[in-house]
Amino acid sequence: MKVLQEPTCVSDYMSISTCEWKMNGPTNCSTELRLLYQLVFLLSEAHTCIPENNGGAGCVCHLLMDDVVSADNYTLDLWAGQQLLWKGSFKPSEHVKPRAPGNLTVHTNVSDTLLLTWSNPYPPDNYLYNHLTYAVNIWSENDPADFRIYNVTYLEPSLRIAASTLKSGISYRARVRAWAQCYNTTWSEWSPSTKWHNSYREPFEQH
């Protein structure tokens, strides 16, 4: 049994880091493998993650981490029984993938304005809470070409757009994702999408 693709890990900078790797053949990850992880710090102890299958030869492990600070560094040991298959390290602050925003809502009752709001996925005491920026994706269910991205570079989790920038009388969907420049993170996953029917009064044209 050998590791084909070494584990790569990302942290949500809150409580979970996710490591993925590939073995050289079909593997029952949960029964055959264990990923041990230990914070490099005085008096810390090793903890065990039981991996799950992620495709035939792929494995994924969700490491519980209490919380994260920038100095944290972890040792990782991948074991198959008594055999050490791989040894590495992981610094969560250098491999951050934020949590996806939630509770995306489209408010259509503001005259001729669409107000999209969502929730910051972090509690206020987390460092990322005040460092997230967002991308909002809006697309038409009827027209694949009608696809647009709005970058939200301010901290408030909301976006206002004129209803008239979208076509009237058709359904749209929106989703949002987050990233943090301070840690040069990857983008989060997209939030679940929300759907609404866009309708607004065309301005009366005088001839």
Epitope: Y37, L39, E45, D66
Partner: antibody, heavy 125, light 112 residues
């Protein structure tokens, strides 16, 4: 009530051995690291040794390394300090203290928040 | 090893007056994000040490609020807002960022 009680001190000749014990009660003993601190007569406090909750990690002061062994029996809620090759400069009151919570991935530190009453070790010929 | 230096070593105080003890470390005790591994202990005559302050500024359970800790990095201070007779004893700072844990020399607080 959270409590630590030391025992095992006494008078020993240079080169001799003693084993100190520290019995914990009122808390989940295995979840905490434990530490030994000593105080020579008329002197300040000196750290001696620490051990993680499971006993897998141990640390020693240079002055006792190779002579003292820290260990624990979590089934008995007891911490030990085996002291061999004793020297006159090991004469001190020895305290055990509760250290950080190591059951979590990050050891949570609340100071050395519980101390025993101390046990006196005298090394003299 | 991290060297801890306390001052003053002797501190005569009038009851009701404030008192302040300084502790300096030879290297930063800040692990990250403000986790400063610096504690203050009081040892009264004939007794075991007792924890006053942990992680530089957190008051231990049962410690009167006249005791406060501050500082970060290498400079730390213990303040007693109004000294009482029962506060006499030796005060020690201690770092637990790395082994060996190291203590300051101790400050003897006495009543004038």
């Amino acid at each position: 009530e959270v409590q630590l009680v030391e025992s095992g001190g006494g008078l020993e000749q240079p080169g001799g051995s003693l084993r100190l014990s520290c019995a914990g009660s009122g808390f989940t003993f295995r979840d905490y690291a434990m530490t030994w601190v000593r105080q020579a007569p008329g002197k300040g406090l000196e750290w001696v040794s620490s051990i993680s909750g499971s006993g897998s990690n141990t640390y020693y002061a240079d002055s006792v390394k190779g002579r003292f062994t820290i260990s624990r029996d979590n089934s008995k809620n007891t911490l030990y300090l085996q002291m061999n090759s004793l020297r006159a400069e090991d004469t001190a009151v020895y305290y055990c203290a509760r250290d950080r919570l190591t059951a979590a991935v990050r050891p949570y530190y609340y100071g050395l928040d519980v101390w025993g009453q101390g046990t006196t070790v005298t090394v003299s010929s | 090893d991290i060297v801890m230096t306390q001052s003053p070593l002797s501190l005569p105080v009038t009851p009701g007056e404030p008192a302040s003890i300084s502790c300096r470390s030879s290297q930063s005790l800040d692990y990250s994000s403000g986790y400063n591994y610096l504690d203050w202990y009081l040892q009264k005559s004939g007794q075991s040490p007792q924890l006053l302050i942990y992680l530089a500024s957190n008051r231990a359970s049962g410690v009167p609020d006249r005791f406060s800790g501050s500082g970060s990095g290498t400079d730390f201070t213990l303040k007693i807002s109004r000294v009482e007779a029962e506060d006499v004893g030796f005060y020690y700072c201690m770092q637990s960022l790395q082994t060996p844990y190291t203590f300051g020399q101790g400050t003897k607080l006495e009543i004038k």
